[in-house]
């Protein structure tokens, strides 16, 4: 259960399948009737530098089936993998095997999941067992976090702090797991 499911998943990578599966049809409730006006969390801005594009982070898409015990999702899901180190955007192409890695001379910058989203999945089970419905937590975006010399690997620091977030603004995708508690697990997973 929990993140153990991620580490123990029988992951099947499916090349050349770039689109998200169709979400299941809306249930009988009309969600839009119940939305907070302009609701949602504003986008997360981890960099409080003058030029936000100064640093970049690799986001690689991959597609896989998710499993829960012996059960497997009826359709594959597509998510991101946050890969490698962070560096100046101009030196860090968003693809594997091209360009040079930027090596920071100061603190170490790490590319980790920033936000997550929920996706409904139906899991088909063997032996006539009833199908299961779950909501899987998928990586939706990545960000650079800084490791300072005063903190160990599990103490990843944001470039800046976030201000209060009222439910106003653009509609973002949901968010990240705790770097403090889960960085080791994320590194194992990715």
């Amino acid at each position: 259960q929990g993140w153990q499911a991620f580490k123990n998943d029988a992951t099947e990578i499916i090349p050349e399948l770039g689109e998200y599966p169709e979400p299941p049809p809306e249930l009988e409730n009309n969600k839009t009737m119940n939305r907070a006006e302009n609701g949602g969390r504003p986008p997360h801005h981890p960099f409080e530098t003058k030029d936000v594009s100064e640093y970049s982070c690799r986001e690689l898409h991959f597609t896989r089936y998710v499993t829960d015990g012996p059960c497997r999702s009826a359709k594959p899901v597509t998510e991101l993998v946050c890969s490698g180190q962070c560096g100046p955007a101009r030196l860090l192409p968003n693809a594997i095997g091209r360009g040079k890695w930027w090596r920071p001379s100061g603190p170490d910058f790490r590319c980790i999941p920033d936000r997550y989203r929920a996706q409904r999945v139906q899991l088909l089970c063997p032996g006539g067992e009833a199908p299961r419905a779950r909501k899987v937590r998928l990586v939706a975006s990545c960000k650079c976090k800084r490791l300072t010399r005063f903190h160990n690997q599990s103490e990843l620091k944001d470039f800046g702090t976030e201000a209060a977030r009222p439910q106003k603004g653009r509609k973002p995708r949901p968010r990240a797991r705790s770097a403090k508690a889960n960085q080791a697990e994320l590194e194992n997973a990715y």
């Epitope: 419905a133 705790s178 889960n182």
Partner: antibody, heavy 121, light 109 residues
């Protein structure tokens, strides 16, 4: 382990507003899907609204539309629920509840201790 | 808004088996309603027993199980204990909007 600590009991007059806070520890607020549930004395649980991670929006129960506002202060990892135009039937214990940040979304796994709001003239 | 219905009260003998059900005014309850079951004792906050129809939590005693039964969500308690006397609530997910049932008062007698 997610822990939620709510603000203390409040007594309000009809027509006033109340703002209940819910402080998150163990994780950061933005990692979690926070919901608010209330329970009037001797009555059942009633979902008021919460954050829907499928599309990154806060949804409010129809009954509370226009009267409730759910906000967050991520600098202090504190969620707030403000209910306005209070009436006597809003007297209830108000709970915040959140998921456990696992691989599968499981909502309402962790609950605050509850905040009693009494509306009386 | 949908209405979620539960038995107002049920009684079970110690060691006995009882099934609590949860229906929806909109039709049959399915796995896509992600049924939840909560236990609440007097003066305490609720605690989750079952998520997503049948998924138990680390703290859920083995004697509790969740399922779908005849178009309803069901919580079965096999081998009831005195400490299982409590109020039980189901919760259904209507596409991101949640609705609680009215609760079932379970007496172990």
């Amino acid at each position: 382990e997610v822990q939620l600590v709510q603000s203390g009991a409040e007594v309000k007059k009809p027509g006033a507003s109340v703002k209940v806070s819910c402080k998150v520890s163990g994780y950061t607020l933005t990692e979690l899907s926070m919901h608010w549930v209330r329970q009037a004395p001797g009555k059942g649980l009633e979902w008021m609204g919460g954050f829907d991670p499928e599309d990154g929006e806060t949804i409010y129960a129809q009954k509370f539309q226009g009267r409730v506002t759910m906000t967050e202060d991520t600098s202090t990892d504190t969620a707030y629920m403000e209910l306005s135009s209070l009436r006597s039937e809003d007297t209830a214990v108000y709970y915040c509840a959140t998921d456990s940040a696992g691989y599968w979304y499981k909502f309402f796994q962790h609950w605050g201790q509850g905040t009693l709001v009494t509306v009386s003239s | 808004q949908a209405v979620v219905t539960q038995e107002p009260s049920l009684t079970v003998s110690p060691g006995g088996t009882v099934t609590l059900t949860c229906g929806s005014s909109t039709g049959a309850v399915t796995i896509d309603h992600y049924p939840y079951w909560f236990q609440q004792k007097p003066g305490q906050a609720p605690r989750t027993l079952i998520s997503d129809t049948d998924d138990k939590h680390s703290w859920t005693p083995a004697r509790f199980s969740g399922s779908l039964l005849g178009g309803k969500a069901a919580l079965t308690l096999s081998g009831a204990q005195p400490e299982d006397e409590a109020e039980y609530y189901c919760l259904l997910d209507y596409g991101g909007t949640f609705v609680f049932g009215g609760g079932t008062k379970l007496t172990v007698l």
